[in-house]
């Protein structure tokens, strides 16, 4: 759920979701239209597509809870629990080191970014 | 080779508190990715899954019975332990103890090994 | 929590015959799971992630589907396949079995 993703995105950027991610760009935070603006947004397009996917097979993704282990740098998600928690995992896990790879091109002046202003085609899944 | 053996009090009163063990060999509670469930049946009927217990002693319960459940372990002994509060005759069926399939495969991927079974009967 | 259906619940079977037993869920799953169960004895694993043997089932069972709708079939009933046969899935928590099909031989 929201709670997982937001605790695996600050251990593995070491930033604070809330403030640097959740909204930033045309994607990352809820919702998300138009073309992604960096690298960054990209991640969180890919997230939206990865959920999106999640929920056609039927999974709660923002109230499902997984497990996993966070060490020297790497998230392992545990082999607990049922089939939508570890792929839930996955998306999440996916998300946080997309983010940490793109640490270098992140640009402040797209958090909080107008959403109106986000145009052209979103990209499909 | 993996054995599981459950073993409970036959039969007790409504009201009362049942308290089940799961003895087991072939394994151990200890090792990283396992665990142990609670399955029954009601004579005649289907089965439903009750509890599960991991290794780190990270514990799941079936929401719509929750409340009365309480599932532990004892490692060293090889035992896992499930007890039921506040039954009635509803609760009377054959209780198991489950084990998932070796690694690589998941909890999501059902019950490879299973007890023989022991049958509760509880009376009014 | 997801509900799964059988069908038929109880159903016989010449020696020979094709057999197929239907388990629907209340939402879409992404496996399922298949056990056998004779009288008296505890279930055993028959099928792993839909389509799978577990190990000892003789090959002419065969499982199959996708989504909310799957089954299980004998592609020629034999005397030894008269038993209960229960779906499980664990897509979402809580894992949850069908009610269960009784195969009798005629």
């Known amino acids: 759920g929201i709670l997982n993703l937001n605790k695996m995105v600050k251990q593995v950027t070491g930033k604070m979701p809330i403030l640097s991610y959740w909204p930033y760009g045309c994607h990352c935070g809820l919702g998300g239209r138009g073309q992604p603006k960096d690298a960054t947004d990209w991640c969180c397009q890919t997230h939206d597509c990865c959920y999106d996917h999640l929920k056609t097979q039927g999974c709660s993704i923002y109230k499902d809870y997984y497990r996993y282990n966070f060490s020297q740098g790497n998230i392992h998600c545990s082999d607990k629990g049922s089939w939508c928690e570890q792929q839930l995992c996955a998306c999440d896990k996916e998300v946080a080191f997309c983010l940490k790879r793109n640490l270098d091109t992140y640009q402040k002046r797209l958090r909080f970014y107008w959403r109106p202003h986000c145009r052209g085609q979103t990209p499909g899944c | 080779q993996v054995t599981l053996k459950e073993s409970g009090p036959g039969i007790l009163q409504s009201s009362q508190t049942l308290s089940l063990t799961c003895s087991f060999s072939g394994f151990s509670l200890s090792t990283s990715g396992m665990g142990v469930s609670w399955i029954r049946q009601p004579s005649g009927k289907g089965l439903e899954w009750l509890a599960h217990?991991?290794?780190?002693?990270?514990?799941r319960y079936n929401p719509s019975l929750k409340s009365r459940l309480t599932i532990s372990k004892d490692t060293s002994r090889n035992q896992v332990f499930l007890n039921i509060t506040s039954v009635d005759t509803a609760d009377t069926a054959t209780y198991y103890c489950?084990?998932?399939?070796?690694?690589?495969?998941?909890?999501?991927?059902?019950?490879?090994?299973w007890g023989q079974g022991t049958l509760v009967t509880v009376s009014a | 929590q997801i509900v799964l259906t059988q069908s038929p619940a109880i159903m016989s079977a010449s020696p020979g015959e094709k057999v197929t037993i239907s388990c629907s869920a209340s939402?879409?799953?992404?496996?399922m799971y298949w056990y056998q169960q004779k009288p008296g004895s505890s279930p055993k694993p028959w099928i792993y992630r839909t389509s799978n043997l577990a190990s000892g089932v003789p090959a002419r069972f065969s499982g199959s589907g996708s989504g909310t709708s799957y089954s299980l079939t004998i592609s020629s009933m034999e005397a030894e396949d008269a038993a209960t046969y229960y779906c499980q899935q664990y897509h979402t928590y809580p894992p949850t079995f069908g009610g269960g099909t009784k195969l009798e031989i005629k």
């Open positions: 939402s879409s799953v992404s496996y």
């Open positions: 217990i991991y290794w780190d002693d990270d514990k």
């Open positions: 489950a084990r998932r399939p070796e690694a690589p495969y998941y909890d999501y991927d059902g019950f490879a090994y």
